[in-house]
């Protein structure tokens, strides 16, 4: 269940995934899973002591059960 080292470049400037457009690449297990890509920009979470290591995007929960894993509440609404 282990995976090889993850490239830091993948965090700051993600390269294209090996997945088809309707899929997302799950970094925890390093394979493609079904996902919805509808999302809206959100600000950085309030109180974070440094920039979160990702672009602050809010995936929508319902789109075909989207990357369901990716549906989450973030603080700091506009």
């Amino acid at each position: 269940m282990r995976r090889g080292p993850r490239s830091l470049r993948g965090r700051d400037a993600p390269a294209p995934t090996p997945c088809v457009p309707a899929e997302c690449f799950d970094l925890l297990v390093r394979h493609c899973v079904a996902c919805g890509l509808l999302r809206t920009p959100r600000p950085k979470p309030a109180g974070a002591s440094s920039p979160a290591p990702r672009t602050a995007l809010q995936p929508q929960e319902s789109v075909g059960a989207g990357a369901g894993e990716a549906a989450l509440p973030l603080p700091g609404l506009l």
Partner: antibody, heavy 126, light 107 residues
């Protein structure tokens, strides 16, 4: 209110089976991966298993592999842990928890467990 | 499996103190490090995710820093409700692993 309510714990003899349940409410259960984590008395937290939102993938900790099975019924908003061939060392408080992730482009990044059940005690003893 | 080593295992502090807890990973985990608070008889509560991002609803006196193998949780001014056990956890790879905790006690 986002909530996970657990049931199914109890006292069981070594070698026997038990099934734990975790009922979700207040969020779209079918859109989230779910975990089981356990904590033996006075011990560290130990990750047990994870299941994807659609049950397409399941992973287990080495100590339970081949004995425990994680499953879910999205129509009932319920997560399960079937525990077979129980051992004394399986005695612990078991927690269900929601997988917390961010979508970054087409990458899913895992950020831990953001909602936890109240815990249920499993005691394996003869 | 990635081993997380927390230090100290316990500490005594007073209300108002600045408290620092460290977590070291056995290999680089980038920023995939999360912190939890657990009180006796209760489930853990997520405080910090991605090493430094404050979870919604968590007081701003909690902060996290670090990347790679060395991480820190800081409580800027300890409050009575902060006396608890704190755990780090990596979400870089399966199996997920936790540190063994730091118990923050009243001096």
């Amino acid at each position: 209110e986002v909530q996970l309510v657990q049931s199914g714990g109890g006292v069981v003899q070594p070698g026997r089976s038990l099934r734990l349940s975790c009922a979700a409410s207040g969020f779209t259960f079918s859109s989230y991966g779910m975990h089981w984590v356990r904590q033996a008395p006075g011990k560290c937290l130990e990750w047990v298993a994870v299941i994807w939102y659609d049950a397409s993938n399941k992973y287990y900790g080495d100590s339970v592999k081949g004995r425990f099975t994680i499953s879910r019924d999205n129509s009932k908003n319920t997560l399960y842990l079937q525990m077979n061939s129980l051992r004394d060392e399986d005695t612990a408080v078991y927690y269900c928890a929601r997988r917390f992730t961010h979508l970054r482009g087409q990458y899913i990044e895992d950020y831990g467990l953001d909602v936890w059940g109240q815990g249920t005690t499993v005691t394996v003893s003869s | 499996e990635i081993v997380l080593t927390q230090s100290p295992s316990s500490l005594s502090a007073s209300v108002g103190d600045r408290v620092t807890i460290t977590c070291r990973a056995s290999q680089s985990i980038s920023s995939y490090l999360n912190w939890y608070q657990q009180k006796p008889g209760k489930a853990p509560k997520l405080l910090i995710y991605a090493a430094s991002s404050l979870q919604s609803g968590v007081p701003s006196r909690f902060s996290g820093s670090g990347s790679g193998t060395d991480f820190t949780l800081t409580i800027s001014s300890l409050q009575p409700e902060d006396f608890a056990t704190y755990y780090c956890q990596q979400s870089y790879s399966i199996p997920l692993t936790f540190g063994c905790g730091t118990k923050v006690e009243i001096k």
